[in-house]
Amino acid sequence: VLPTKPENISCVFYFDRNLTCTWRPEKETNDTSYIVTLTYSYGKSNYSDNATEASYSFPRSCAMPPDICSVEVQAQNGDGKVKSDITYWHLISIAKTEPPIILSVNPICNRMFQIQWKPREKTRGFPLVCMLRFRTVNSSHWTEVNFENCKQVCNLTGLQAFTEYVLALRFRFNDSRYWSKWSKEETRVTMEEVPHVLDLWRILEPADMNGDRKVRLLWKKARGAPVLEKTFGYHIQYFAENSTNLTEINNITTQQYELLLMSQAHSVSVTSFNSLGKSQEAILRIPDVHEKTFQYIKSMKAYIAEPLLVVNWQSSIPAVDTWIVEWLPEAAMSKFPALSWESVSQVTNWTIEQDKLKPFTCYNISVYPVLGHRVGEPYSIQAYAKEGTPLKGPETRVENIGLRTATITWKEIPKSARNGFINNYTVFYQAEGGKELSKTVNSHALQCDLESLTRRTSYTVWVMASTRAGGTNGVRINFKTLS
């Protein structure tokens, strides 16, 4: 049997090393050998050699861009010879280089790196295309940036200040289809700049009889701020809206501060500073004690989308683009220090990983609209990050026992023992020696009428309270219908 005709010839020019061609079939059943012929130097020279496998590497001396070469493979065995079609290869279009070497990565300006690199080969003035990929050290998501006509220095811009990045580079000849492999990764930090503007919030205590009240200011690094950003301290400035008297408090090192303000509206600002200067002001308006605040949230709901707790709300006006979300375990004695809060921009939803909240704990979640520096009326709901079965079942009593009827009543389970929202109650009842029957009522009901009972019969009854995680039975009690 003649050998199979060699097909699918595919060549890669490993730049300045060799020209490697492979073909199909990769494995022949019978003893097949090959003669590979390369025509190069614009058709003026030939190079032939034997190959025992479906692959051959021509030496560097046969492959010199910008040549166009042709490759032909002849398969032969004891029964005869079969030639492939002739394939033509523009060397530079199939050139593949070694991964480049990054010589230096220098932070220049605040949000930019200058990368100096070199190919391992002499690229001889062939136009190159580079691709840089980068990510922050704590991310697994790479961003890729292309540089056409790239020189051996490229500037990566649009980064975050004072952030640690990992970057790598690859390149190819402009006319080549093959990228080099990625260079060794380099890790560098962009230059520090003044701190980002802070996220600022407040807890308002009720006013005393004079209208004075305590306002606890809370602030933190904004979500978009560099991870490495350091601050030496904070400055607070505030003034009453009807006064020009400005009060300053300097060099605070904590991230909260309590002010005692009079009843009128105040404007409060907080800045943070480092060796390079101070951030922009984060400003919040504290309303007059008697002021009516605006209500901009129409509705709100919370639900679980594993592994997140999601809160969605509907705004009645599109102008609001910032919201403050507060969350607090319902059992907390006071807002501070149990309160957690976060600023949300451009969206009307908020998510938190379930495991960042205590399981089986009811949270009060409030969302405040922020328009300019003014804070509107909150919308509040309750939610559990994770529900469990109640810690105990309902305490149950039997009332109004008749010939064939009885009323089962129970007490609401204390909130601390619920472990979730009670969905429903199920009343189980069973006549002595009879089969178990049940009746389910909604979570608002605290009693259930049993009918069609058998007279002068002993019954056992118990009530199960259920959350989405399952139910817990109360203590079994016995009663006997009248005769």
Partner: antibody
Framework: SVEESGGRLVTPGTPLTLTCTVS????????MSWVRQAPGKGLEWIGI?????TTYSASWAKGRFTISKTSTTVDLKMTSLTTEDTATYFC?????????????WGPGTLVTVSS | AAVLTQTPSPVSAAVGGTVTINCQSS????????LSWFQQKPGQPPKLLIY???TLASGVPSRFKGSGSGTEFTLTISGVQCDDAATYYC???????????FGGGTEVVVK
């Protein structure tokens, strides 16, 4: 074929441009080198211009010797000539677009620098 | 800049004998094989014999053989003929082309 021209007697400090005229092949496919040889001495590599117009020069030639090309000629511009630059200057074609496999040589042109 | 040292010089050989010329580079040549050998006779331009350290140039007799890698290279002429009397030069190419250079040459005298 390859042929150099422009060699002559010049005084020190005079600039001089040598021209290499090629025929029978395209400069867009091959690299061209300039090499010189002082009387009775060995060969000295001056520089190369690749098929893609990129030039590389020996460290000693940088700044004084410049290689450029048109579609059929390759020039070697020389400035601040000294008596040490007296030599036969060869223009030669490589195999391929950039290699030092210099396979096709011109006969050379003599440059004499003397006061 | 790189320095290419050729030894010995001159070298004499009898017709039919073998001549070995060494070329030592002060640094590794590009890709370990960017080295060419040339033959030059008086009054003539050089002629390419070997390129990429071991590849015989077109039209060059097979009695010329190049070998070596990195910094040490050899040109061997076996079955020397009268016509082989000439000066032989090596030319090295480097990672930085500014270092490219010829060796000092080796004169071969055929007796």
């Amino acid at each position: 074929s390859v042929e150099e021209s422009g060699g002559r007697l010049v005084t020190p400090g005079t600039p001089l441009t040598l021209t290499c005229t090629v025929s029978g092949f395209s400069l867009s496919n091959y690299a061209m080198s300039w090499v010189r040889q002082a009387p009775g001495k060995g060969l000295e590599w001056i520089g190369i211009i690749t098929y893609g117009d990129t030039t590389y020069s020996a460290s000693w030639a940088k700044g004084r010797f410049t290689i450029s090309k048109t579609s059929t000629t390759v020039d070697l511009k020389m400035t601040s000539l000294t008596t040490e630059d007296t030599a036969t200057y060869f223009c030669a074609r490589s195999y391929g677009g950039y290699s030092l496999a210099i396979s096709l040589w011109g006969p050379g042109t003599l440059v004499t620098v003397s006061s | 800049a790189a320095v290419l040292t050729q030894t010995p010089s001159p070298v004499s050989a009898a017709v039919g004998g073998t001549v070995t010329i060494n070329c030592q580079s002060s640094q590794s040549v590009y890709m370990n094989n960017e080295l060419s050998w040339f033959q030059q006779k008086p009054g003539q331009p050089p002629k390419l014999l070997i390129y990429y350290a071991a590849t015989l140039a077109s039209g060059v007799p097979s009695r010329f053989k190049g070998s070596g890698s990195g910094t040490e290279f050899t040109l061997t002429i076996s079955g020397v003929q009268c016509d082989d009397a000439a000066t032989y030069y090596c030319l090295g190419g480097y990672d930085d082309d500014a270092d490219n250079a010829f060796g000092g040459g080796t004169e071969v005298v055929v007796k």
